[in-house]
Interface confidence: low
Amino acid sequence: AGVFELQIHSFGPGPGPGAPRSPCSARGPCRLFFRVCLKPGLSEEAAESPCALGAALSARGPVYTEQPEAPAPDLPLPNGLLQVPFRDAWPGTFSLIIETWREELGDQIGGPAWSLLARVTRRRRLAAGGPWARDIQRAGAWELRFSYRARCELLAVGTACTRLCRPRSAPSRCGPGLRPCAPLEDECEAPPVCRAGCSLEHGFCEQPGECRCLEGWTGPLCTVPASTSSCLGLRGPSSATTGCLVPGPGPCDGNPCANGGSCSETPGSFECTCPRGFYGLRCEVSGVTCADGPCFNGGLCVGGADPDSAYICHCPPGFQGSNCEKRVDRCSLQPCRNGGLCLDLGHALRCRCRAGFAGPRCEHNLDDCAGRACANGGTCVEGGGAHRCSCALGFGGRDCRERADPCAARPCAHGGRCYAHFSGLVCACAPGYMGSRCEFPVHPDGVSALPAAPPGLRPGDPQRYL
């Protein structure tokens, strides 16, 4: 676990001619905000792929109103860092996508309008705990200057942040042997010392000197795989009936969750679901009130009405959990229809629709044929949101306005000669061939191998293609 941090230093017109003077449209003032998206690995990912490492949205910047005579400035930016918490190990290689969004503040129907102003993508290798990396990127006519780093939260050891403690405000790192902080404590938490030699990976303890095994492991130090050890004559606790090693207790055996918490097994471990008023790895921490600030991510804390419910967190959109500690990946529900791109802006979801679709969820298929007449007898066809004309013979192009030469593709086979005709084309077949495209050979006895010529047409006569 840890935090990826992005500091935007400046965003403004790039060097050179044609640089925009203002990010705002002619409709009036606007302000900027930024969205950062992190994806693991260095591979070129589709823009629509999820931000698997996390995403964050900045606050809105100050309102910008263009001064007609003033030189184009660096634009006023939101204050502070963009921080993307990551829960698991830092992957080291990642894709960084930074989007600059414009919020127009003019008289918009239905409130402010958002539009994507610039998007930069960088594929990078970065070790956690390292210094700030600086970068300058151009996106179209805009230039973005920024710095970024990944830092482990507290026990900043190693480049992947594999064991950590996360407080809300704290010095550089936890000391040795500390497990992650209880979610609401501003500090690190020290678990008990286990029996000497108790397996780091497969054992745990709740009391000093204890060594309890996770599911699938056994032995006094939890070092023996339960599935392979039975009846192999290994020393250890055994069953009187079989002489086999007894599998170690499952993670939830004896219910490690205190204070009425319910235990559920997870791969190789367990998870406690705590009743309100308790938290911590094993629901061991109690007595929390709103004064302790238990609601994360802007959640509103309300004092509970009964003693069993010391507080209740009302979570803002996009967060859930008894402490609003879990981010809801609302885009994972794929709310955007018809291939629209989902953007979780924090305060709201937005769908960026593909051409031909509209609506909050891209649910409306725009009638591209409305007001789009196809010329020269062509008919308009809707398909996938794209306007297309099916043109009459002899015409082509997007709107059937271009005259097409039907003979250009040399449609007459076996040396037949092509003639353009008002309703299509006519093939004059070479001797020995017949058919609308001169595709059928004529037998020497005058009988064709395939369908006979229509009445009134002899082999060799021009065949008009209807």
Epitope: P192, V193, S199, P208
Partner: antibody, heavy 119, light 107 residues
């Protein structure tokens, strides 16, 4: 039975080097924090460094950073402290101590080895 | 670095006395505080971990408590073998730091 035995101490001149060893028995150092703590004559305890061998995690006190290096050989179940650029103020009894993965304290200590830095 | 300010630096007491030693952390160190006993020429011994948990084999007359950033080691009834120097230690943040020690002497 858990046991820690330090060795390698002695008299060394300022600017010199010394390598301390801490041989562990009765437990596996790979899943424990191995600490070095020192105590100057007549003074209190001062933490020097730790290593967590499984992941190669290390941490140092500011006073020794860049001069001392902690390491471990899990095949020999031994932790080491390489001390370079030694100063008079490094003179102390150096203790090796164990801290469990699940635990912040130091539950087993060696008997200590004396390092004297003097010309 | 976190300072652990231990007081008193020395005290004189008699067998059977109740003895209290305190340690104040310069900032929050959670409960990651341990107490050690050291006798002359010997290595320290762990008494208390996690601020208030009694380590295996340590007599129950030793106890630890925490109040905010103040940590207390109490010996409820001092015994002859308890005359020694006591150290607190925090392991919440690196670098690990010790208090300067409290020497408990016979009155």
């Amino acid at each position: 039975e858990v046991q820690l035995v330090e060795s390698g101490g002695g008299l060394v001149q300022p600017g010199g080097s010394l390598r301390l060893s801490c041989a562990a028995s009765g437990f596996n150092i790979s899943s424990s924090y191995m600490h070095w703590v020192r105590q100057a004559p007549g003074k209190g305890l001062e933490w020097v460094a730790y290593i967590y061998p499984s992941y190669g995690y290390t941490s140092y006190a500011d006073s020794v950073k860049g001069r001392f290096t902690i390491s471990a050989d899990t095949s020999k179940n031994t932790a080491y402290l390489q001390m370079n650029s030694l100063r008079a103020e490094d003179t102390a009894v150096y203790y090796c101590a164990r801290g469990g993965y699940y635990y912040h304290g130091m539950d087993y200590w060696g008997q200590g080895t004396l390092v004297t830095v003097s010309s | 670095d976190i300072q652990m300010t231990q007081s008193p630096s020395s005290l004189s007491a008699s067998v059977g006395d109740r003895v209290t030693i305190t340690c104040r952390a310069s900032q929050s160190v959670s409960s990651a505080v341990a107490w050690y006993q050291q006798k002359p020429g010997k290595a320290p011994k762990l008494l208390i971990y996690s601020a208030s948990s009694l380590y295996s084999g340590v007599p129950s007359r030793f106890s630890g408590s925490r109040s905010g950033t103040d940590f207390t080691l109490t010996i409820s009834s001092l015994q002859p073998e308890d005359f020694a120097t006591y150290y607190c230690q925090q392991a919440s943040w690196s670098p690990i730091t010790f208090g300067q020690g409290t020497k408990v002497e016979i009155k």
